[in-house]
Structure formats: structure tokens, C-alpha cells
């Protein structure tokens, strides 16, 4: 379907033509369930929430509504040479029994993620192959997509930037010196943080950093960097904050776990990354976000998820977590407590927790 956002003069600033498929994991009384559905043909642009961006202040956004209160939002940003969907967000209403039968919660959920949708200014983004955007418990796949923002004349430009998946892979040629865009999955590392009162963090997980940055040639790239078991780990134990620091000579990654005393839940609340990127226009890369709520479980229990999880830290950084089991604040006998599995893993014998 074609979606369009126009400015006050009636000129389109965003045009998007794609079909979308949603895969959503949610809880039912009888355990976790996965629903897959397509963006319906009657999906419409929410005109009063979509925008061409306010002069000098904000970037354009496309908000698409369908069903009973579900919205898919694409937030765009640009620099001198490129534009991108810096953030895709999906709001879904679990009380919609048509899409989410027997959902144990009736709440409205919001998930979001950075994307790889980017193109040269004055060219359209084109991706015939599926473009997948992973969010917490949701995967959105765009098929046969033509998208352009910062438009000039209400029509797609002649030129196009093709997505990686559409480009033919070279059969020969010298190996690239730069890290691959999607490297092999990271290796599982074991972490243990001990304070005066014993162990306050026990974790087994494979971590990957997805970093979007501007290279010296002014091209924007998204690269994945695996955290190695050989990296040095350290940390600290506090009453309300437990930190895990994993570092090597090029980077320092700090994970901060917080606790909600009233609900007795621990969760990943902060991520801080300092890293050197030799081929970046600004080689020193620093990002932090202290308002996260991921990897959440009851204090005394452990959070476990075998499925890959993408934690959106900022538009430049996403933390990908594989095969995670983590327990913070209260750890008895240096062993994981009862398991609270993520919804995606779908083993209904265990207690499941929203996050």
C-alpha cells in the first residue's frame, strides 16, 4: 500500500509503498503464543500525528494506523548526504481479540528499534527482499519496499539506494578489512560480580553491539561487534544499582541493573558504551541510556531467554543479547535461582514475565 505525508502546501515530504508482516509474541493464560498477521489493506496514515517536521526542530514521521488502536511509526532523520528511518516503533493493543486471542493482558504495548533503512538524499530506498526490524517480542518485515523522505515534488526520485539484501554478492574479490555487517553470533561469556555481601550479579550471555556511525568518507554504516569472553570484566554491588563492566583496549561496555523495591523486580536500566572506531569520522564513540527496562525478573529469580533480544539504547546503538541468563542483587550460593523465561522462548512449564 502507498502511504504519504504532505506539508501545508500539499507537497509530499514522505512517500512509502510497502507491504508489512508482523510477528508478535504475547502471553495467554495457557502460555506464550505467536501471532503473525499482515498490515491490512485499510491501514491509513494518521494525519494529525504524521509530520513533515517542524522547521528547525524536528524530523519527519509517518504514522500508520490499523485495526483496534495499532500503529506503526517510521521516524526519519537526515544529514548532508543520507537519510534514514532512525527509529521504527509499533504500538499494539492486546485487547484486540481478533489479532491477539486469549491474551492474558489487555494493555497497550510499545516496542521500538533502530533500522537499517537508509538511502542517499534525493534517492529512494528500495528493498524487494524482506527488510526485518526486530523489537522486543515483535518482528516487523517490510516486503517490496519503496520509501523516500525529504521529498521535493510529491514523486519518488529516479535514483535509488538498494538495501544490502538486494545487492548481488560479489563472487570474487579481495576480502574486506572492515568487520562484517552481520558477523557470526557472539560467544557466550560468564560474568560474576561480587561485593562485600557476596555475589550480586550472575550472568551467562553472548553480547553483540550494533553500532551506526558516520565513516571518514561520510557514509553511514551499521556494524556489529561481538563482545569476547577474553574481555576483562569487573563491576560493583550497590543497594539500588549493580554494574557490570566489560572492557578491552578499544571499548568499555557498562551494564547497569536497577531494582524496583515495591514490585521486587530487577532489570537492565542502563547501558554505557565508550569505544574507539578507527574508521569513523569521530573515532571516539560514547553512548549512554539510563532509562531502559529490559532483562526483567523477580529479585531472587533469574531472567532467561534463548531467543536473540535487541535492546534499543539509542539511534546509534542497539545491544543484541543471545542465550541470556542473568540474576541481579540477590544471588544465593553463586547459583541461578528459579527461572523466569522470556515470552519468545515459549516453554509454558516455566513462569513467564512481561518485559
Amino acid at each position: 500500500a502507498m502511504f504519504m505525508v504532505k506539508n501545508g502546501n500539499g507537497t509530499a515530504c514522505i512517500m512509502a509503498n510497502f507491504s508489512a508482516a508482523f510477528s508478535v509474541n504475547y502471553d495467554t493464560k495457557s502460555g506464550p503464543k505467536n501471532m503473525t498477521f499482515d498490515l491490512p489493506s485499510d491501514a491509513t496514515v494518521v494525519l494529525n500525528r504524521s509530520s513533515c517536521g517542524k522547521e528547525n526542530t524536528s524530523d519527519p514521521s509517518l504514522v500508520i494506523a490499523f485495526g483496534r488502536g495499532h500503529t506503526l511509526t517510521l521516524n526519519f532523520t537526515r544529514n548532508a548526504t543520507r537519510y534514514s528511518v532512525q527509529l521504527m516503533s509499533f504500538v499494539y493493543n492486546l485487547s484486540d481479540t481478533h489479532l491477539f486471542p486469549n491474551a492474558s493482558s489487555k494493555e497497550i504495548k510499545t516496542v521500538e528499534s533502530i533500522t537499517d533503512i537508509r538511502a542517499d538524499i534525493d534517492k529512494k530506498y528500495r528493498c524487494v527482499s524482506g527488510t526485518q526490524v526486530h523489537m522486543n517480542n515483535v518482528t516487523v518485515t517490510l516486503h517490496d519496499a519503496t520509501i523516500q523522505a525529504y521529498l521535493s515534488n510529491s514523486s519518488f526520485s529516479r535514483g535509488e539506494t538498494r538495501c544490502e539484501q538486494d545487492r548481488p554478492s560479489p563472487t570474487t574479490g579481495p576480502p574486506s578489512p572492515s568487520p562484517p555487517l552481520v558477523p557470526t553470533n557472539p560467544t557466550v561469556s560468564k560474568y560474576n560480580v561480587t561485593g562485600n555481601n557476596g555475589t550480586c550479579l550472575l550472568a551467562s550471555m553472548a553480547l553483540q553491539l550494533n553500532i551506526t556511525y558516520l565513516k571518514k568518507d561520510n557514509k553511514t554504516v551499521t556494524r556489529a561487534f561481538n563482545i569476547s569472553p577474553n574481555d576483562t570484566s569487573s563491576g560493583s554491588c550497590g543497594i539500588n544499582l549493580v554494574t557490570l563492566k566489560v572492557e578491552n583496549k578499544n571499548r568499555a561496555l557498562e551494564l547497569q541493573f536497577g531494582m524496583n523495591a515495591s514490585s521486587s523486580l530487577f532489570f537492565l536500566q542502563g547501558v554505557r558504551l565508550n569505544m574507539t572506531l578507527p574508521d569513523a569520522l569521530v573515532p571516539t564513540f560514547s553512548i549512554s541510556n539510563h532509562s531502559l527496562k529490559a532483562l526483567q525478573a523477580t529479585v531472587g529469580n533469574s531472567y532467561k531467554c534463548n531467543t536473540e533480544e535487541h535492546i534499543f539504547v539509542s539511534k546509534m546503538l542497539s545491544l543484541n543479547v543471545f542465550s541470556v541468563q542473568v540474576q541481579a542483587f540477590k544471588v544465593d550460593s553463586d547459583r541461578f535461582g528459579s527461572v523466569e523465561e522470556c515470552v519468545q522462548d515459549g516453554n509454558s512449564m516455566h513462569h513467564h514475565h512481561h518485559h
Epitope: 522547521e55 528547525n56 537526515r78 544529514n79 548532508a80 548526504t81 534517492k123 521535493s152 526520485s157 535514483g159
Partner: antibody, heavy 118, light 106 residues
Framework: QVQLQQSGAELVKPGASVKMSCKAS????????IHWVKKSPGQGLEWIGA????????PYSQKFKDKATLTADKSSSTTYMQLSRLTSEDSAVYYC???????????WGQGTLVSVSA | DIQMTQSPPSLSASLGGKVTITCKAS??????MAWYQDKPGKGPRLLIH???TLQPGIPSRFSGSGSGRDYSFSISNLEPEDIATYYC????????FGGGTKLEIK
């Protein structure tokens, strides 16, 4: 209509720096890149760099990345170019230019003449 | 940066005649090519964009063609006011001018 008004001619000594301005009017300043182009008898037209006033992002030509610094002031819709460590090779007319979307460089300022002389 | 090789550096032609200038890019520029006329004491003037699209007000004596890495620009029925230096510009990946061609009338 679109107008780009550049600052006046400059006579500067070798080794010094110069900062010239380009005031834009007749359109939304943050919607378009402003480019800077050098015109000299020896080298013809050369693209120096561009700046996107929305966020200050500024790609440069490899040749000028250590010579030129581009900045923009959204409040006055003005773009600036500073040239450092000037030599006689930098004597030229410098133009600020705006593209018309994908129609290349359509709008040109009147140019700023820089003369480097001891 | 993409390099643009423009030739010839200078040429001389008769009034009423035709001239052709070529530009070769160091890589495929997907027809993102423009041509400019530059006269002493005046700012450059855009004649053609997108390889072959004439700007409003530019006479049809001017024309452009090409694809991939190779592009050409022609002026037919030369007139005295065509005396100028002509430049190509690629704007597919950043922006690069060619070295210029100085046109003189015999």
C-alpha cells in the same frame, strides 16, 4: 525567491585565517544543504564541502578537509566558511550554492573574493 | 571522492558550428550529471541537470547525453555569447567538478 547574500571581499596575509558568510533567504533554511565552491584561474571550479544546517553535518572534499571549516547559524539563516593557514593558492572567488533538490547547484551567491598577499 | 576527467581543456570553433565536450567519471554516476557555463565576472550558470534535462530558459542548442561513466555535452549553432568555460559536475556521490573546457570562437 531564493537568495544567497555573501560577505564582501577580503585581503589577508599568508598564514592568516578568513571567515566569510552566506545569508540565505526565500526558503526554509534547514531544508537544504549549502555548498561552497572555489573558483580560481588555475583550478577552475572546485567543490569544497557542504553543510546541512538542520544538524551541522558537513562532508568535505578530501582536498579541503584540512583547509575549510563550515558552520551554520539557524537563528540567522547564515552559513560560514573559515579558511585557515592561507597561502597564495587560496586566492580565489568563493561561492556559496544551494541545490534545488536533485537538480544540482541551481542557486549561487554573488561570490566572495579572497586575495592572499604579503 | 569520485574523479571527473573533462576533455578537451580548450577548444576553438566557428560561429554556427558545433562543439562537443566529454566527461568521464571514475565510477558509475547513474546519470547524476550537470553542466555549467562560467563567464568572467559572473557566477556559474546551470544549463543541464540529470544528464540531459535542460534548465528553464536555456536554448535547445545545448544538449547532454550519457550513462554509466561516460557523458557528453554539445552546443550546436554556436553564437558569440557562448564564449565561456564549461564544467561538468557529478552529484551521485558527494559532488565533483570536471577540470573545465575553455571555448573560444575562431
Amino acid at each position: 525567491q531564493v537568495q544567497l547574500q555573501q560577505s564582501g571581499a577580503e585581503l589577508v596575509k599568508p598564514g592568516a585565517s578568513v571567515k566569510m558568510s552566506c545569508k540565505a533567504s526565500g526558503y526554509i533554511f534547514t531544508n537544504y544543504n549549502i555548498h561552497w565552491v572555489k573558483k580560481s584561474p588555475g583550478q577552475g571550479l572546485e567543490w569544497i564541502g557542504a553543510i546541512y544546517p538542520g544538524n551541522g553535518d558537513a562532508p568535505y572534499s578530501q582536498k579541503f578537509k584540512d583547509k575549510a571549516t563550515l558552520t551554520a547559524d539557524k537563528s540567522s539563516s547564515t552559513t560560514y566558511m573559515q579558511l585557515s593557514r592561507l597561502t597564495s593558492e587560496d586566492s580565489a572567488v568563493y561561492y556559496c550554492v544551494r541545490a534545488n533538490w536533485d537538480v544540482a547547484f541551481a542557486y549561487w551567491g554573488q561570490g566572495t573574493l579572497v586575495s592572499v598577499s604579503a | 571522492d569520485i574523479q571527473m576527467t573533462q576533455s578537451p581543456p580548450s577548444l576553438s570553433a566557428s560561429l554556427g558550428g558545433k562543439v562537443t565536450i566529454t566527461c568521464k567519471a571514475s565510477q558509475d554516476i547513474d546519470r547524476y550529471m550537470a553542466w555549467y557555463q562560467d563567464k568572467p565576472g559572473k557566477g556559474p550558470r546551470l544549463l543541464i541537470h540529470d544528464t540531459s534535462t535542460l534548465q528553464p530558459g536555456i536554448p535547445s542548442r545545448f544538449s547532454g547525453s550519457g550513462s554509466g561513466r561516460d557523458y557528453s555535452f554539445s552546443i550546436s549553432n554556436l553564437e558569440p555569447e557562448d564564449i565561456a568555460t564549461y564544467y561538468c559536475l557529478q552529484y551521485d556521490n558527494l559532488w565533483t567538478f570536471g577540470g573545465g573546457t575553455k571555448l573560444e570562437i575562431k
